[in-house]
């Protein structure tokens, strides 16, 4: 008789999840000499321990504490790039501008990027059928709590000028309900962070509007200013050219506005 299994609204755990996490850990520690000391089996055990045998709607930040300790990594505080709804371009940028870091350029972010996972209360099984959806089921699910925890800590670490890449093609360029809007903005430390600089990425080829005047950007400016952090904003009209100019800054076409 098949065991009754909780059906959640979201997709199940990514197939080959344990193997993927372990392989990513090994790859990351091989590429980054400063993380060579990390024991990837211990990392996987700590990751697994955060959600296995626990109700997937009752996960806490404390559940991830052992993993957070094992993944400790000093990030240059003045080289942090946050992003919202424009992950691919942010990652393309840090692949070229190697001294800047998104969360997914850290070990913990790299391990979990684009993956889904959850377990079941009182069994050691991973649920590959379904996992809780943040909206339809519960917010304290393994994936959401993980990203909330690491995003908060990543924002806490930032100093000097912090950059954020925002998607100018979205109806809400700045969304208060995004991870950036609900977690990272509120965990920037005014004693350390002088300025938040937003880069608004344009989507349309002929879009010459100043999206820094968008009402949601003004809302972001207001939130940041109230936290005693300065705010600045730049339009990136041509993201393709922007990336090209990061690669080849001495190119003659890179002196004009991008």
């Amino acid at each position: 008789v098949p065991r009754w299994r909780q059906q959640w609204s979201g997709p199940g755990t990514t197939k080959r999840f344990p193997e993927t996490v372990l392989a990513r850990c090994v790859k990351y520690t091989e590429i980054h000499p400063e993380m060579r000391h990390v024991d990837c089996q211990s990392v996987w055990d700590a990751f697994k321990g955060a959600f296995i045998s626990k109700h997937p709607c009752n996960i806490t930040e404390e559940d991830y504490q052992p993993l957070m300790k094992l993944g400790t990594q000093t990030v240059p505080c003045n080289k942090i790039l946050l992003w919202s709804r424009i992950k691919d371009l942010a990652h393309q940028f840090t692949q070229v501008q190697r001294d800047m870091f998104t969360l997914e350029d850290t070990l913990l972010g790299y391990l979990a990027d684009d993956l889904t996972w959850c377990g079941e209360f009182n069994t050691s099984k991973i649920n590959y059928q379904s996992c809780p959806d943040w909206r339809k089921d519960c917010s304290n699910n393994p994936v959401s709590v993980f990203w909330k925890t690491v995003s908060r800590r990543f924002a806490e670490a930032a100093c000097d000028v912090v950059h954020v890449m925002l998607n100018g093609s979205r109806s809400k360029i700045f969304d208060k309900n995004s991870t950036f809007g609900s977690v990272e903005v509120h965990n920037l430390q005014p004693e350390k962070v002088q300025t938040l600089e937003a880069w608004v990425i344009h989507g349309g080829r002929e879009d010459s509007r100043d999206l820094c005047q968008d009402p949601t950007i003004k809302e972001l400016e207001s939130i940041i200013s109230k936290r005693n952090i300065q705010f600045s904003c730049k339009n990136i009209y041509r993201p393709d050219k922007f990336l090209q100019c990061v690669k080849n800054p001495e190119d003659s076409s890179c002196t004009s506005e991008i």
Partner: nanobody
């Protein structure tokens, strides 16, 4: 850069008490998880107790019910109250400050000796 300085170590009889204190520099120390570790002669350093930035505590099984960790974010201190001390608690005790993306820092250590 975080700097940590332990104090309060010394010689105490079995069953006695000591209070270790760790003074820390740095305006954002409240963001760090703070811990006490110990290292006995010829042994590896081991976690004694930790308190997260959110205030959650965790203790080694060997000290549960005897030791209490606390923090004062306003004063930038973390303390370890040690009661019912045993000879096997003899070690150098180290203060630790750790943040996932800001790194880990250690004090120089303070000697605790439990002996009659």
């Amino acid at each position: 850069q975080v700097q940590l300085q332990e104090s309060g170590g010394g010689l105490v009889q079995p069953g006695g008490s000591l209070r270790l204190s760790c003074a820390a520099s740095g305006s954002t120390l409240r963001l760090y998880d703070m811990g006490w570790y110990r290292q006995a002669d010829g042994k590896q350093r081991e976690l004694v107790a930790e308190i997260t930035s959110g205030g959650s505590t965790n203790y080694a099984n060997s000290v549960k019910g005897r030791f209490t960790i606390s923090r004062d974010n306003a004063e930038n201190t973390v303390s370890l109250q040690m009661n019912s001390l045993k000879p096997e608690d003899t070690a150098v005790y180290y203060c630790n400050a750790e943040h996932t993306f800001m790194g880990a820092y250690w004090g120089q250590g303070t000697q605790v000796t439990v002996s009659s």
